[in-house]
Interface confidence: medium
């Protein structure tokens, strides 16, 4: 049994880091493998992660960390029984993938303005809480070409757009994702999408 693709890990910088790797053949990850991880810190505790299958030869492990600071570094040991298959390290602050925003809501009752709001996925005491910026994706269910991205570079989790920038009388969907420049993170996953029917009063034409 050998590791074909070494573990790569990302952290949500809150409580979970996710590591994925591939074995050289079909593997029952949860029964055959264990990923041990330990903060590189005197008197720290060692922890064991039981991996799950992620495709035939792929494995994924969700490492509970419960707390993360920028200086943290973890040792990772991948074991198959008594055999050490791979040894590495992982610094969560250098591999951050933020949690996805939630509770995306489209408010259509503000005159002819659409107000999109969502929730910051982090609690106020987390470092990322005040460092997230967002991308909002809006698309038409009827027209695949009607697809747009709005970059929200301020901290408030909301976006206002004129309803008239979208076509009237058709349904749209929106979703939002986050990233943090301070840790050069990857983008989060997209939030679940929300749907609304766009309608607004056409202005009278002037003759």
């Amino acid at each position: 049994m050998k590791v074909l693709q070494e573990p790569t890990c990302v952290s949500d910088y809150m409580s979970i880091s996710t590591c994925e790797w591939k074995m050289n053949g079909p593997t029952n990850c949860s029964t055959e493998l264990r990923l041990l991880y330990q903060l590189v810190f005197l008197l720290s505790e060692a922890h064991t992660c039981i991996p799950e299958n992620n495709g035939g030869a792929g494995c994924v492990c969700h490492l509970l960390m419960d707390d993360v600071v920028s200086a943290d570094n973890y040792t990772l040991d991948l074991w198959a029984g008594q055999q050490l298959l791979w040894k590495g390290s992982f610094k969560p602050s250098e591999h951050v993938k933020p949690r996805a925003p939630g509770n995306l809501t489209v408010h259509t009752n503000v005159s002819d303005t659409l107000l999109l709001t969502w929730s910051n996925p982090y609690p106020p005491d987390n470092y990322l809480y005040n460092h997230l910026t967002y991308a909002v994706n809006i698309w038409s269910e009827n027209d695949p070409a009607d697809f747009r991205i709005y970059n929200v570079t301020y901290l408030e989790p909301s976006l206002r757009i004129a309803a008239s920038t979208l076509k009237s009388g058709i349904s749209y969907r929106a979703r939002v994702r986050a990233w943090a420049q301070c840790y050069n993170t990857t983008w989060s996953e997209w939030s679940p999408s929300t749907k609304w029917h766009n309608s607004y009063r056409e202005p009278f034409e002037q003759h």
């Epitope: 005197l42 008197l43 505790e45 060692a46 922890h47 064991t48 419960d66 707390d67 600071v69 200086a71």
Partner: antibody, heavy 118, light 111 residues
């Protein structure tokens, strides 16, 4: 919200016994080493005992002043943590705090008072 | 055992001024890139509260007027500007090795 609540303190005679309990909530208890720290009236802080996690074989450590008299234990399924104190001495009179430990002792309970007196 | 010597034992500071508390360890508490020194605040009738961990990191929720510095054997806690609510006893603590020890405490009062 992390919470640690101690109980079991009280008045006991010298050479008597007492068992302190600490109920933990709001965090993954089984991931943390836990400590007991005490503070005699009007005095400073003294580390008493420490217990590690299951992955670390529930290893235990004690201050010399309590070794062979105190026993630290934990029940991860109930998120409980204990200090069995035997052969108590008057100098064990103190407020006893249960404390979570990661990089430092980051969360403390309110404490339970132990008085050893005849 | 590592002995932590804290000074001064008590400190009287005017509102808005700087309070500086020192802690000296009998041997180095720094290794592998970490300094295993921490600072706690204790108010009467309350448990200690972690202010600074690993010498210089401010614990979440602690005001920015608290700062820590140092490495090896010499460490400092600074409070600036001092506020009324900072009246308390401050302890340094190491977890470089067992047994863990604490400094004897510094009582901060406002002039």
């Amino acid at each position: 919200e992390v919470q640690l609540v101690e109980s079991g303190g009280g008045l006991v005679q010298p050479k008597g016994s007492l068992k302190l309990s600490c109920a933990a909530s709001g965090f993954s208890f089984n991931m943390y080493a836990m400590n007991w720290v005490r503070q005699a009236p009007g005095k400073g802080l003294e580390w008493v005992a420490r217990i590690r996690t299951k992955s670390n074989h529930y290893s235990t450590y004690y201050a010399d002043s309590v070794k062979d008299r105190f026993t630290i234990s934990r029940d991860d399924s109930a998120s409980m943590f204990y200090l069995q104190m035997n052969n108590l001495k008057t100098e064990d009179t103190a407020m006893y705090f249960c404390v979570r430990h990661l990089r430092a002792m980051d969360y403390w309970g309110q404490g339970t008072s132990v008085t050893v007196s005849s | 055992d590592i002995v932590l010597t804290q000074s001064p034992a008590s400190l009287v500071v005017s509102l808005g001024q700087r309070a500086t508390i020192s802690c000296r360890a009998s041997q180095s508490v720094s290794t592998s890139g970490y300094s295993y020194m921490h600072w706690y605040q204790q108010k009467p009738g309350q448990p200690p509260k972690l202010l600074i961990y690993l010498a210089s990191n401010v614990q979440s929720g602690v005001p920015a007027r608290f700062s820590g510095s140092g490495s090896g054997t010499d460490f400092t806690l600074n409070i600036h500007p001092v506020e009324e609510e900072d009246v308390a006893t401050y302890y340094c603590h190491h977890n470089r090795d067992l047994p863990f020890t604490f400094g004897s405490g510094t009582k901060l009062e406002i002039k």
